[in-house]
Interface confidence: medium
């Protein structure tokens, strides 16, 4: 009976990077008003928890809380919202949400082919490296909810590494790295220090921030 | 609790062959590599050879490479290490390690050990 | 590869500090921070005391610390107890993606 009603959204607090043994509360809302919410991660299948909705101000949601980050709570998850008390009548899944738990190994650097100071409209490509094995390499900017990831090219100079092109350089950003083997894609290394690249002729770095309704309400399930 | 149960050691003569079992409880087994490690009598620690959690990646010193097989059963949380061609230099006590991600690239450290088990290659 | 330098042995009077070193390469100790250091008690198996260089895992007592420079990693004990008299053994990620261990040290507790 999946799909009965429209699928909520699946967020995370602070956000879907997750250090070792810290928190993040994934919340699960929706403006239909569920009676329950259910959250999975995938590949455990019968790692599914229950949660009661609260309704508040035309949204109901539910917090998980996982209160203390470890490799084996990492990989993805969705929630489902349901009406009734049977399990078995859920709205279709949220979109996927990646938990990934960062700092395990150590941080990679970040430089910028051209420097960190570019003119408007030049190509940037930013390049992340290490002396560790990494397979991938993962490029986040602040500001924007999703990495870009490329793998790690051969060893050269006793460094792996990969080239981001970025493209015509329009605003500025702070750019951080991380890297990853292909056996655990949700366990990170520690960020590399951040990158700032400032783009010349461009008056504003600003960014929008996502709506997404309070988490400061209500007392959250915890998953460990 | 974690716990690691080394087991299948014993005299072998050179040339022939074991098979060392790890029984792990305590944590979830495919979430973190495993490895082996192994210490001649009186002598200290060498890494021998390590695995992924998922069992896609294993690793090798180059002293047992060709003649050592690592492998594991995430359904029964079991290691092993298969040990062919075996010499006389191969005599030590082998341990299990629990390693501290799934990757288990040589970027690991062993958090949890096992008592060993001892492997006696002699004619 | 061969096995990093540690002194084959050191001691120390309880209450005091000892110092063991594990000198390596560019190749393994001075390349990486991933340098663990390990205790083992006669017909024991090893514990795990300091990874990455410097930190402690829980349960280990912060008598023991870790630090690093260029190619040589050091493992310090202060207050030194009768129960920390055991052998000690460096280990590090090398470029060739291996784990390599030191020879070992005894530490003696007078």
């Known amino acids: 009976h999946e799909g009965v009603h429209r699928k909520p959204s699946l967020l995370a607090h602070p956000g879907r990077l997750v250090k070792s043994e810290e928190t993040v509360i994934l919340q699960c809302w929706s403006d239909v008003m569920f009676e329950h919410f259910l959250l999975h991660r995938e590949g455990m299948f019968n790692d599914t928890l229950r949660l009661i909705g609260e309704h508040h101000d035309g949204v109901s949601k539910a917090n998980f809380s996982i209160s203390r980050m470890t490799q084996d709570l990492a990989g993805t998850y969705r929630c489902y919202g349901s009406v009734t008390h049977s399990p078995y009548q859920v709205s279709a899944p949220s979109d996927p949400l990646d938990i990934v738990i960062i700092g395990l190994y150590e941080k990679p650097s970040l430089s910028a082919q051209l420097g960190p100071t570019v003119l408007a409209g030049e190509n940037v490509t930013l390049s992340c490296s290490s002396r560790s094995s990494y397979d991938m390499y993962h490029l986040s900017r602040e500001g924007e909810a999703h990495e870009r990831r490329l793998p790690a090219g051969p060893k050269v100079n006793g460094t792996f590494q990969a080239d981001f092109p970025l493209g015509p350089a329009t605003h500025g950003g702070t750019y951080r790295c991380f890297g990853s083997f292909h056996d655990s894609p949700y366990e990170w290394s520690k960020s590399s220090d951040p990158l700032l690249v400032s783009v010349t002729g461009n008056p504003s770095n600003s960014w929008p921030s996502p709506t997404e309704p309070s988490s400061k309400t209500g007392n959250p399930r915890h998953l460990h | 609790e974690v716990q690691l149960l080394e087991s299948g050691g014993g005299l072998v003569q050179p040339g022939g062959s074991l098979r060392l079992s790890c029984a792990a409880s305590?944590?979830?087994?495919?979430?973190?590599?495993m490895h082996w490690v192994r210490q001649a009598p009186g002598k200290g620690l060498e890494w021998v050879s390590t695995i992924s959690g998922s069992g896609g990646s294993t690793y090798y010193a180059d002293s047992v490479k060709g003649r050592f097989a690592i492998s594991r059963d995430n359904s029964k949380s079991t290691l092993y290490l298969r040990l062919t061609g075996l010499r006389a230099e191969d005599t030590a006590v082998y341990y299990c390690a629990k390693g501290r991600s799934r990757a288990g690239a040589g970027e690991d450290y062993f958090d949890f050990w096992g008592q060993g088990t001892l492997v006696t290659v002699s004619s | 590869q061969s096995a990093l330098t540690q002194p084959a042995s050191v001691s120390g009077s309880p209450g005091q500090s000892i110092t063991i070193s594990c000198t390596g390469t560019?190749?393994?100790?001075?390349?990486?921070?991933?340098v663990s250091w390990y205790q083992q008690h006669p017909g024991k198996a090893p514990k795990l005391m300091i990874y990455?260089?410097?930190n402690r895992p829980p349960g280990v007592s912060n008598r023991f610390s870790g630090s690093k420079s260029d190619n040589t990693a050091s493992l310090t004990i202060s207050g030194l107890q009768d129960e920390d008299e055991a052998d000690y053994y460096c280990?590090?990620?090398?470029?060739?993606?291996?784990?390599?261990f030191g020879g070992g040290t005894k530490l003696t507790v007078l």
């Open positions: 305590g944590f979830t087994f495919s979430s973190y590599a």
């Open positions: 560019s190749s393994d100790v001075g390349g990486y921070n991933y």
């Open positions: 990455d260089v410097s």
């Open positions: 280990s590090s990620y090398t470029s060739s993606n291996t784990i390599i």
